[in-house]
């Protein structure tokens, strides 16, 4: 019961996390800026992974997509890649984990197969969460290192001047959504991996034969070699040795100095 609950909760937590990663990836508010030097109106600029928007206090808002791929900063491309990989892995993980759920019966799927699928989905969720956390962290680092800089003046070759606009760059809502979502996906993945241990069968299903010698002398029955190799008449794994040979199913054997395996 605890295993089912852990698996189910892990699935739900991962589902919420992946939904959050998708939301964060699509959001425009990855970085937000207040443009200080504008004497006209309060101008609020916010940017996402796919487009940049300008909003004015007058209510005017305009967004423009980054239509080029080659000209964009490498860091932005890296963040996009990490988030997309996170979403893809998470989606596959969700698909796998649906079939792995203990409460869902699909044909005669064994617990060992479900355990393997649970572990696979758990690992996928963990990697997915790590990708999202890494992507958001790389972007946050890019903001901190590249943009919290003092105003600098430069001169163009044409004689006109260009200066960086003094802006206050702040972390957008998408960064926090991404961090939380990545964390949830990671936690969900860990829960799935924990559930996998409970799903995995404790004992092996094959019948091992242990041979317990009752005395110091072991009587050898003819045909024993044939039986051990699977040839000859003794192919039913019959007891070959006299004196206490039992299958695991028949008796619990305790190790002694006279055990022969």
């Amino acid at each position: 019961m605890a295993v089912t609950a852990c698996q189910g909760l892990g699935f739900v937590v991962s589902l919420i996390g992946i939904a959050g990663i998708i939301a964060a990836t699509c959001m425009d508010q990855w970085s937000t800026q207040d443009l200080y030097n504008n004497p006209v109106t309060a101008v609020f600029n916010y940017q996402g992974l796919w487009r940049s928007c300008v909003r004015e206090s007058s209510g005017f808002t305009e967004c423009r997509g980054y239509f080029t791929l080659l000209g964009l900063p490498a860091m932005l491309q890296a963040v996009r890649a990490l988030m997309i990989v996170g979403i893809v892995l998470g989606a596959i993980g969700l698909l796998v984990s649906i079939f792995a759920l203990k409460c869902i019966r699909i044909g005669s799927m064994e617990d060992s197969a479900k355990a393997n699928m649970t572990l696979t989905s758990g690992i996928m969720f963990i990697v997915s969460g790590l990708c999202a956390i890494a992507g958001v962290s790389v972007f946050a680092n890019m903001l901190v290192t590249n943009f919290w800089m003092s105003t600098a003046n430069m001169y163009t070759g044409m004689g006109g001047m260009v200066q960086t606009v003094q802006t206050r760059y702040t972390f957008g809502a998408a960064l926090f959504v991404g961090w939380v979502a990545g964390g949830l996906t990671l936690i969900g993945g860990v829960m799935m991996c924990i559930a996998c241990r409970g799903l995995a069968p404790e004992e092996t299903n094959y019948k091992a034969v242990s041979y317990h010698a009752s005395g110091h002398s072991v009587a050898y029955k003819p045909g024993g070699f044939k039986a051990s190799t699977g040839f000859g008449s003794n192919t039913k794994n019959k007891k070959i040795y006299d004196g206490g040979a039992r299958t695991e199913d028949e008796v619990q054997s305790y190790p002694s100095k006279h055990d022969y395996v």
Partner: nanobody, 122 residues
Framework: QVQLVESGGGLVQPGGSLRLSCAAS????????MGWYRQAPGKQRELVAV???????NYTDSVKGRFTISRDNAKNTVYLQMNSLKPEDTAVYYC????????????????WGQGTLVTVSS
């Protein structure tokens, strides 16, 4: 690279009119505010008029009611219609634009033109 090219300056009599235009070109991603500043001989550069992408305009007190700023977002161009010109309007008029570059859409830059001279004299 980005270029801001002003045109329309020249010599005009007091009470006359001039229309300045400034076209921005180059690897521009998005232009936010565009404006006009002026610098009279021996004085500091001052704001004349500025207009945001949404069309909100602001003017310095001395030109209110006489100057009109407008812009064409599609052409990345800003205009300054100057009416009832006075001798104290004589200055070099500079175009100014806050913009992003295509190569770096996360950073804002203020670009300036080289200026166009407006002389109001009889």
């Amino acid at each position: 690279q980005v270029q801001l090219v002003e045109s329309g300056g020249g010599l005009v009599q007091p009470g006359g009119s001039l229309r300045l235009s400034c076209a921005a070109s180059g690897s521009i991603f998005l232009i936010n505010a565009m404006g006009w500043y002026r610098q009279a001989p021996g004085k500091q550069r001052e704001l004349v008029a500025v207009i945001t992408r949404g069309g909100s305009a602001n003017y310095t007190d001395s030109v209110k009611g006489r100057f009109t700023i407008s812009r064409d977002n599609a052409k990345n161009t800003v205009y300054l219609q100057m009416n009832s010109l006075k001798p104290e309007d004589t200055a070099v008029y500079y175009c100014n634009a806050d913009l992003n570059l295509r190569s770096d859409p996360f950073k804002w830059y203020t670009f300036w033109g080289q200026g166009t001279l407006v002389t109001v004299s009889s």
